[in-house]
Interface confidence: low
């Protein structure tokens, strides 16, 4: 088997958001900019007036889904010896139905109010061995992978880069990178997937 011919496709699943981290362990996302979920109905946190037709539900009932995503980790020209499996957070954190408006003639989605998003809740660190072309010595790295997702309330201070919808971002072509037959990004693959339906 010619399994050493990795370098032809090593960039195929590069995830530019992969973070090399210094310590191993499981830890939650830093929470300073996120308010406690339990505060969602208090008036000082954007609670709705009593006449509002939307009945409050526990955030856990919303469809924040954890999708498996398998890829190789890359660092420059080096690629992990094995693929890693992580989670992608997907879905909406809000009512899944249309609601009657105040005068009963039309339908509306939930009005503006507390903004909850399906975003990473916990991360895990995984040690990976990166194989490099040209006889370079393998490198040991630790990468941060999403371990769980949660509906979390956002504030205006929340880092918006966390909030990109994976499917939308994935379908967007990468800039400044010429396509090669074997060097297909996960984003290009997702576009291929969507076009296949």
């Amino acid at each position: 088997h010619h399994h050493h011919h990795h370098h032809q496709g090593w960039q195929a699943f590069k995830n530019d958001a992969t973070e090399i981290i210094p310590e191993l362990g499981e830890y939650p996302e830093p929470p300073p900019e996120l308010e406690n979920n339990k505060t969602m109905n208090r008036a000082e946190n954007g609670g709705r007036p009593p006449h509002h037709p939307f009945e409050t539900k526990d955030v856990s009932e919303y469809s924040c889904r954890e999708l498996h995503f398998t890829r190789y980790v890359t660092d420059g020209p080096c690629r992990s010896a094995k693929p890693v499996t992580e989670l992608v957070c997907s879905g909406q954190c809000g009512p899944a139905r249309l609601l009657p408006n105040a005068i009963g003639r039309g339908k509306w989605w939930r009005p503006s109010g507390p903004d909850f998003r399906c975003i990473p809740d916990r991360y895990r660190a995984q040690r990976v061995q990166l194989l490099c072309p040209g006889g370079e010595a393998p490198r040991a790295r630790k990468v941060r992978l999403v371990a769980s997702c949660k509906c979390k309330r956002l504030t205006r201070f929340h880092n918006q880069s966390e909030l990109k919808d994976f499917g939308t971002e994935a379908a967007r072509p990468q800039k400044g990178r010429k396509p090669r037959p074997r060097a297909r990004s996960a984003k290009a693959n997702q576009a291929e997937l969507e076009n296949a339906y």
């Epitope: 010619h2 032809q8 496709g9 195929a12 999708l67 498996h68 995503f69 190789y72 693959n189 997702q190």
Partner: nanobody
């Protein structure tokens, strides 16, 4: 919708062979690198082998020389030929395309008795 259906598992004695198949749909199979994973009871899912879109292959050390991954792009199917099976190969085996958001298939159980 991406669909992955694994089959071919079963009960076999140590030293025996099995051929697993994974029928896929919902994506352009020939463009994707395909992997087999396995999960033994109480253990994490682990990578077994990958076949790249161009045909190159890659294996975990513990199965090199015993397992062979192959693909049939016309049938949108990936295979795993497993020879010289050992009790420690007992697990549920899963296939998946790399680089796609997906839900795992149901897997196929392989049990190797000593």
């Amino acid at each position: 919708e991406v669909q992955l259906v694994e089959s071919g598992g079963g009960l076999v004695q140590a030293g025996g062979s099995l051929r697993l198949s994974c029928a896929t749909s919902g994506f352009t199979f020939s463009r994707f690198d395909m992997s087999w994973f396995r999960q033994a009871p109480g253990k994490q899912r682990e990578f077994i082998a990958t076949i790249f879109s161009g045909g190159d292959t890659d294996y975990i050390d513990s199965v090199k020389g015993r397992f062979t991954i192959s693909r049939d792009n016309a049938k949108n199917t990936v295979y795993l030929q497993m020879n010289s099976l050992k009790p420690e190969d007992t697990a549920v085996y899963y296939c998946c395309p790399l680089g796609i958001e997906y839900a795992w298939g149901q897997g196929t159980q392989v049990t190797v008795s000593s």
